[in-house]
């Protein structure tokens, strides 16, 4: 039975040219996290495997950095980065948990971060 829940940064916004940290946190389960996949809509951005470490998709290498923790840092943001991001937690024995984050990249300097996992 899957008892865990994923908390995410929720809906967040950031300025064009800036950077943002995407964070998810799995709680309420003792399942072992074997891997976390990060996806942007239909594109695999990065994978963090408990044994193999991080793999960043080559096409995103210049703008995506691993961490902090199981999170992902997006750099040099463009308006095209606006959209849905998913953290997919592969766990044993529970199975798969998925969290969703919506990022809006703004032209102006009025970007606000979500209530949770705020970035100073």
């Amino acid at each position: 039975m899957m008892t865990g829940t994923i908390e995410t940064t929720g809906n967040i916004s950031a300025e064009k040219g800036g950077s943002i940290i995407l964070q998810c946190h799995l709680s309420s389960t003792t399942a072992q996290v074997t891997q976390v996949n990060w996806e942007q809509q239909d594109q695999l951005l990065a994978i963090c495997n408990a044994d193999l470490g991080w793999h960043i998709s080559p096409s995103f290498k210049d703008r995506v950095a691993p961490g902090p923790g199981l999170g992902l840092t997006l750099q040099s943001l463009t308006v095209n980065d606006t959209g849905e991001y998913f953290c997919i937690y592969h766990t044993y024995p529970d199975g798969t948990y998925t969290g969703r984050i919506f990022l809006e990249v703004l032209e102006s300097s009025v970007a606000e971060h979500g209530a949770r996992f705020q970035i100073p």
């Epitope: 072992q32 074997t34 891997q35 996806e39 239909d42 594109q43 695999l44 994978i47 495997n49 408990a50 044994d51 193999l52 793999h55 998709s57 096409s59 592969h90 044993y92 024995p93």
Partner: antibody
């Protein structure tokens, strides 16, 4: 250099058993998921089974479920496929392959031929 | 199970030609799509992983694109050593499934 070397293939009668082995070298075997993929003569590729690196949890194609068992011995850097109740349609070249991040199959062995015939 | 449909099943081309092979999944598989090349009597060789990432050591004339359900493998300028059979494979969910293959033959 990553190397995968299958062995254990051969001729077996319908209903018989066979155990395939895949000896791995050149990488930290225990860290990787591994798969068996087969190819019947003149046909395409068919995934058979996979086993995770960290948990040794296993997964099977419906066509072999209940008859085949995938296992691994990380101390010997070896992957196994125990095949029971073999059928003529199991005749194929069997490949073992490394599966980093459970997403792609980056290294394959040379294959071992299993022939099920009376 | 996710079905993978490859087209064409075979094609004839000349050295220097641009060749395109397509693969369609029966449901969305994000970018969990890989391409392999196989020559007679040999094991498959990984060309492209995660839809568009070129495997180390593979010539840059090979490229992959697509996401969701529709994917393409392109060989920009066919070389003599590229005559082989090509397979797509999804790793979105188990069972892993392969396309039926595309045999690239010399015209």
């Amino acid at each position: 250099e990553v190397q995968l070397l299958e062995s254990g293939g051969g001729l077996v009668q319908p209903g018989g058993s066979l155990r395939l082995s895949c000896a791995a070298s050149g990488f930290t075997f225990s860290s990787y998921s591994m798969s068996w993929v087969r190819q019947a003569p003149g046909k395409g590729l068919e995934w058979v089974a996979a086993i995770k690196g960290s948990t040794s949890s296993s997964y099977y194609a419906d066509s072999v479920k209940g008859r085949f068992t995938i296992s691994r011995d990380n101390s010997k850097n070896t992957l196994y496929l125990q095949m029971n109740s073999l059928r003529a349609e199991d005749t194929a070249v069997y490949y073992c392959a490394r599966e980093p991040y459970d997403v792609w199959l980056d290294y394959w062995g040379q294959g071992t031929l299993v022939t099920v015939s009376s | 199970d996710i079905q993978m449909t490859q087209s064409p099943s075979s094609l004839s081309a000349s050295v220097g030609d641009r060749v395109t092979i397509t693969c369609r999944a029966s449901q969305s598989i994000s970018s969990y799509l890989n391409w392999y090349q196989q020559k007679p009597g040999k094991a498959p060789k990984l060309l492209i992983y995660a839809a568009s990432s070129l495997q180390s050591g593979v010539p840059s004339r090979f490229s992959g694109s697509g996401s969701g359900t529709d994917f393409t493998l392109t060989i920009s300028s066919l070389q003599p050593e590229d005559f082989a059979t090509y397979y797509c494979q999804q790793s979105y969910s188990t069972p892993l499934t392969f396309g039926g293959g595309t045999k690239v033959e010399i015209k």
